[in-house]
């Protein structure tokens, strides 16, 4: 991780992807330890944010604007060498979000996979980007980038993430850059979760009073585990989002969510799965999927008495 | 959204101390780091310094060395003002406010008035 | 320390007015500068920066320009809710400083 013995190395906190007017902490780590360093910008654009300045431990840069974008390095303080600093450091790319129109993310086959397999996330827009990155949050490393295809007035690139581990789920988001300003990056798109399951063992599904009840009557779908995990989730055949409800543990030792769906309108097929608050995107096997059938005049649709989750989301705390 | 709040007003002594804090939410407390500003009748807007929240290192302007320090509570997303052996000339409303090595100030507290009287 | 003379100190404009407030570094500051408005009762709030950047949700009447040591603050037409006082700053070396202020009021 670190440089070679006279080099330093150069990182940024939280992220070198950074929206325009947001800030960056960048630490220039020299000898085992964090001095006083200098700050070069490889376009020599926008130097007077260093001005021959020295910076103790860390440097932080904003509000950042478009002209932040670039490749820095730092130097270490080396007060008994001939010119009083290091070698110069690895090259760090900072980039600034919020210059372009935020393009699309999409996953193939869908958000919600297995442990090992393989996800195909695109990036698509109507704007002619030359390359598109892939980011996932939390992560301080550089995002994945690839050369956008233009194909019919659409440019697109294929993100292939796996085979899938815990450390893969998360929330992506991608952006796009326009030529001659690679580091210039769009918004972002709207955030995707992308979730793996079949890691733990698969909570149990019940229907309350039962899985065949009458039009109008009133449905509750438990969902239990001897399993300590803080929260299930619901999803239904056919449906893109999916409820979530803490847990709460019941006196048979048993950690429970009891999910109301209101007077029954329509059948459908149930499934749900535990997750714990220290990974939210990685989720149990499913239980055994539930069919709820309803007699009686089922209209088009089972009314949501809780609000459904959005896309995106999954992978936030319950607070 | 990004909040800056500061404590209550305050009356003190001449040669007594006092601690102004400024609670930060909305970002992340440790990218950015705080600035702290004074603000008298008679010289307008004066820079005392700032605390890199990252690092937690302070840096004072020349006229403030001394007598006022910076200190954080990174846990709580907190900045502290400390203003030891006051003299009546520190009277002024005390402004903290977002940023970096860069000088901006994007998000300002609302200031709190320290009146320092016998 | 770098002296930051605004001017003028004052000023009266009817709403629609274009309103000018400039700002004088004693040395070359690289367009490092920040604009500020301040309204009674409330904090500075932050309108401009690296000389023409507007902040976040600060509205396009609002423009900066300038380099070396000569710097402008332009709002195109005056509204009654820009009466305030305004602030250069320069952000290039410490300690940061402000100009003295200019009152804007509406006529």
């Known amino acids: 991780l670190m440089g070679g013995q006279d080099k330093p190395f150069l990182s940024a906190r939280p992220s070198t992807v950074v929206p325009r007017g947001g800030h960056v902490a960048l630490q220039c780590h020299y000898r085992r330890g964090f001095n006083n360093f200098m700050l070069y910008k490889e376009d020599r654009s926008h130097v007077p944010i260093f001005h021959g300045r020295i910076f103790q431990e860390s440097f932080i840069m904003g509000p950042v604007t478009p002209a932040h974008a670039g490749t820095y390095r730092c130097r270490g303080s080396r007060p008994h060498s001939l010119t009083g600093w290091s070698a110069p450091s690895n090259p760090l790319v900072i980039m600034v979000t919020g210059n372009h129109r935020k393009p699309s993310l999409l996953a193939h086959p869908g958000p919600l996979l297995k442990s090992g397999e393989t996800v195909i996330l695109q990036c698509w827009s109507d704007v002619m980007f030359e390359h598109f990155f892939l980011h996932r949050e939390g992560i301080s490393e550089d995002p994945s980038r690839l050369v956008g295809q233009i194909h019919d007035g659409v440019s697109k690139a294929n993100f292939s993430i796996g085979p899938l581990m815990p450390v893969l789920a998360g929330t992506y988001r991608c952006y796009g850059s326009v030529p001659h300003s690679p580091y210039q990056l769009s918004a972002p798109s709207d955030p995707l979760d992308i979730v793996i399951t079949g890691l733990y063992e698969k909570p149990s599904l019940s229907a309350q009073p039962g899985p065949t009840v009458q039009a109008g009557e009133n449905v509750t779908l438990s969902c239990s585990s001897w399993s300590s995990y803080d929260i299930y989730h619901l999803s239904r055949e056919g449906e893109a989002h999916e409820r979530r409800l803490r847990a709460v543990p019941k006196v048979n030792r048993t950690f429970q969510a009891d999910f109301p769906l209101g007077p029954a309108t329509h059948g459908g097929t149930y499934r749900c799965f535990g997750s714990f608050r220290a990974l939210p995107c990685v989720w149990s096997n499913s239980s055994d999927p539930l069919l709820v059938s309803v007699t009686g005049n089922p209209s088009s649709s089972w009314p949501s008495p809780t609000e459904p989750s959005s896309k995106s989301g999954i992978c936030r705390h319950l607070h | 959204q990004i909040q800056l709040v500061q404590s209550g007003s305050e009356l003190k002594k001449p040669g007594a101390s006092v601690k102004v804090s400024c609670k930060a939410s909305g970002y992340t407390f440790t990218t950015a780091g705080m600035q702290w500003v004074q603000k008298t009748p008679g010289k307008g807007l004066e820079w005392i310094g700032w605390i890199n929240s990252h690092s937690g290192v302070p840096k004072y302007a020349e006229d403030f060395k001394g007598r006022f320090a910076f200190s954080l509570d990174t846990s709580a997303s907190t900045a502290y003002l400390q203003i030891s052996s006051l003299k009546a000339e520190d009277t002024a409303v005390y402004f903290c406010a977002r940023g970096g090595d860069e000088g901006v100030m994007d998000y300002w507290g609302q200031g709190t008035s320290v009146t320092v009287s016998s | 320390d770098i002296v930051m003379t605004q001017s003028p100190s004052f000023l009266s404009a009817s709403v629609g007015d274009r309103v000018t407030i400039t700002c004088k570094a004693s040395?070359?500051?690289?367009?490092?500068v920040a604009w500020y408005q301040q309204k009674p009762g409330q904090p500075p709030k932050l309108l401009i920066y690296?000389?023409?950047t507007r902040h976040t949700g600060v509205p396009d009447r609002f423009s900066g320009s300038g380099s070396g040591t000569d710097y402008t603050l332009t709002i195109s037409s005056v509204q009654a809710e820009d009466v305030a006082v305004y602030y250069c700053q320069q952000h290039y070396s410490t300690p940061w400083t402000f100009g003295g202020g200019t009152k804007v009021e509406i006529k």
């Open positions: 040395q070359d500051v690289s367009t490092a």
């Open positions: 690296w000389t023409s």
